[in-house]
Interface confidence: low
């Protein structure tokens, strides 16, 4: 069923022991309920009990109060399930009988076993609550409450939503107290069947078959499914999207592993030279003064280019090189003489004449001799 | 690093109470829900019940109904299992443990000892 | 309720051997089971959800098989910290039910 209107005896006071006739039981009014629950009559009538019926056993003789759970085969609170929408509206017809024997069906009961009857109706709401009530006769009093709950899955005011909690491959979730889906953590969708992927997995390349999950579509990689895998054996190149091979600077080719700047990325010229790339795999170095080479690794000695005039001798030093000059001669190359014409400078019977610029005089020179003081055989 | 760590465990007597507490660090509480499971000494493992922080939904073992409650305080990533009305055989080792989307328990606390005694 | 039935509730095996446990279940549970182990004094650790899923950091001598109702947890090469008592869980419904476990002695 639905639900269940549950009503609870408590207690029942007949202290005389008489029957509704106001003759007396004997030896005591063994007393058990009969209790008819129908729908809302403004005067409640005799007729079928539409919500259902139950009996009590004996529950006790005259007066008594009623156990929770009592025994002797009867129930309390009593249970009257129902498998419609609760519709808010009730009667009850509660009767108290007395049992001469133990036999408790109608039929075998005198019609004047009556002990007791009350009558009620009006509304009453799904809850947890119970409604206490006491209904008093002449000779009888009855203490009892009552309330109408939903059966295990069934949820709102009317008992009409049906809602089980599953956890397994058809939903995940719990029921709200008016039936409605609580996804447990994790799953989402109208049935909770859906899982809620790791946090930033990308919607588009990246999905799930259970939470926290992150699994990546073709091309795609990474934790969060949003780095592109490149083109198998891309080198030195990125993506965008799928199998691209998008070249780094500086390289080249399909794979991107033809290296467009070796000079960046091997430093091949040497001793503070300048490179030049020229083309793949390709450089040229410009060296500083004073080197040579490929790569300018080999040092220059600066006396190699003879630097020196008039027959000095040159000497390399670390900053360069040094002129010893000859004497009659100076200056950084030994260009400068201290010699005149007067002194008889030209050998080799060169003439000598006079000048004025730089040097004191200068030597014309016969055939098969040069230098400045003609001093050289010419081979 | 996710920790659960209980506390609150005693020696009480039958039908008295006990309030243990789950402080929860190291995950996003409101995202998982805590269960509590407990341990008779020498037994097997018995799940108690479970709550969702966020929600405040609870779910309980028949044999704790109407005696046990869970709740929750997300300002103190805490959760806690109210023990009323208690009884010899509700003697355990109470663990608090993070109920997997899944329903299996990942991350336990290190377990509490109640002891319900005359 | 779900009862989920574990065997044998003790053994006895030597370091490297190969330990089989099983655990039945009283209806159909799908793949909704858990593997945990136990040592005395310490909180019960995850080994193996969803039947046959590797938890992180758990030993690869460990596997778990089975589905519907039942299932096997698998010690490939025991070694000397894999004795312990275990304990199998479904998750099929609530409320989630254990195994009453199985104890892994040295022989």
């Known amino acids: 069923g639905s639900g269940v209107f549950q009503l609870q005896l408590q207690e029942f006071i007949n202290e005389r022991g008489v029957l509704a006739s106001g003759r007396p039981c004997e030896p005591g009014c063994r007393t058990f309920f009969r209790v008819c629950l129908k729908h809302f009559q403004a005067v409640v009538s005799p007729g079928p009990c539409t919500f259902g019926t139950v009996s009590t056993p004996v529950l006790g003789t005259n007066s008594f109060a009623v156990r929770d759970d009592s025994s002797g085969g009867g129930r309390n609170p009593l249970q009257l399930p129902f498998n419609f929408t609760w519709p808010g509206t009730f009667s009850l017809i509660i009767e108290a009988w007395h049992a001469p024997g133990d036999d408790l069906r109608p039929e075998a009961l005198p019609p004047d076993a009556l002990i007791s009857k009350i009558a009620i109706q009006g509304s009453l709401a799904v809850g947890q609550n119970w409604l206490l009530d006491e209904q008093t006769s002449t000779l009888t009093r009855l203490r009892y409450s009552y309330r109408v709950i939903c059966s295990d899955n069934y949820y709102g005011d009317n008992c009409s939503r049906l809602c089980k909690k599953r956890n397994d491959h058809f939903g995940h979730y719990v029921c709200q107290p008016d039936g409605n889906l609580s996804c447990l953590p994790g799953w989402t969708g109208e049935y909770c069947q859906q899982p809620i992927c790791l946090s930033g997995c990308h919607e588009q390349n990246g999905y799930c078959s259970k939470p926290a999950e992150c699994l990546c579509r073709p091309g795609w990689q990474g934790r969060l499914c949003n780095e592109c895998i490149p083109h198998n054996g891309c080198r030195h190149g990125t993506c965008s999207t799928p199998w691209q091979c998008t070249c780094d600077e500086g390289w080249g080719g399909l794979f991107c592993d033809q290296d467009l700047n070796y000079c960046t990325h091997h430093s091949p010229c040497k001793n503070g030279a300048t490179c030049s790339n020229s083309g793949q795999r390709s450089y040229t170095c410009t060296c500083r003064p004073g080197y040579t080479g490929v790569d300018c690794e080999l040092e220059l000695s600066e006396c190699d280019s003879n630097p020196c005039r008039n027959g000095g001798s040159c000497k390399d030093q670390e900053d360069g090189y040094h002129c010893l000059c000859p004497p009659g001669y100076y200056g950084l190359h030994c260009e400068h003489s201290t010699l005149s014409c007067a002194d008889s400078p030209c050998f080799n019977g060169g003439s000598c004449r006079e000048r004025n610029q730089g040097a004191n005089y200068a030597c014309e020179c016969p055939p098969n001799f040069t230098g400045s003081n003609c001093e050289k055989k010419v081979d | 690093e996710v920790q659960l760590v209980e506390s609150g465990g005693g020696l009480v007597q039958p039908g008295g109470s006990l309030r243990l507490s789950c402080a929860a660090s190291g995950f996003t509480f409101t995202d998982n829900w805590i269960s509590w499971v407990r341990q008779a000494p020498g037994k097997g493992l018995e799940w108690v019940g479970v709550i969702n922080p966020n929600s405040g939904s609870t779910d309980y073992a028949d044999s704790v109904k109407g005696r046990f409650t869970i709740s929750a305080d997300t300002s103190k990533n805490t959760a806690y299992l109210q023990m009323n009305s208690l009884r010899a055989e509700d003697t355990a080792v109470y663990y608090c443990?993070?109920?997997?989307?899944?329903?299996?328990?990942?991350?336990w606390g290190q377990g509490t000892l109640v002891t319900v005694s005359s | 309720d779900i009862q989920m039935t574990q065997s044998p509730s003790s053994l006895s095996a030597s370091v490297g051997d190969r330990v089989t446990i099983t655990c039945r279940a009283s209806q159909d549970v799908s793949t909704a089971v858990a593997w945990y182990q136990q040592k005395p004094g310490k909180a019960p650790k995850l080994l193996i959800y969803s039947a046959s899923f590797l938890y992180s950091g758990v030993p690869s001598r460990f596997s778990g098989s089975g589905s519907g109702t039942d299932f096997t947890l698998t010690i490939s090469s025991l070694q000397p910290e894999d004795f312990a008592t275990y304990y199998c869980?479904?998750?099929?419904?609530?409320?989630?039910?254990f195994g009453q476990g199985t104890k892994v002695e040295i022989k």
């Open positions: 869980q479904q998750s099929y419904t609530t409320p989630p039910t």
């Open positions: 443990a993070r109920d997997n989307f899944g329903g299996y328990f990942d991350y």
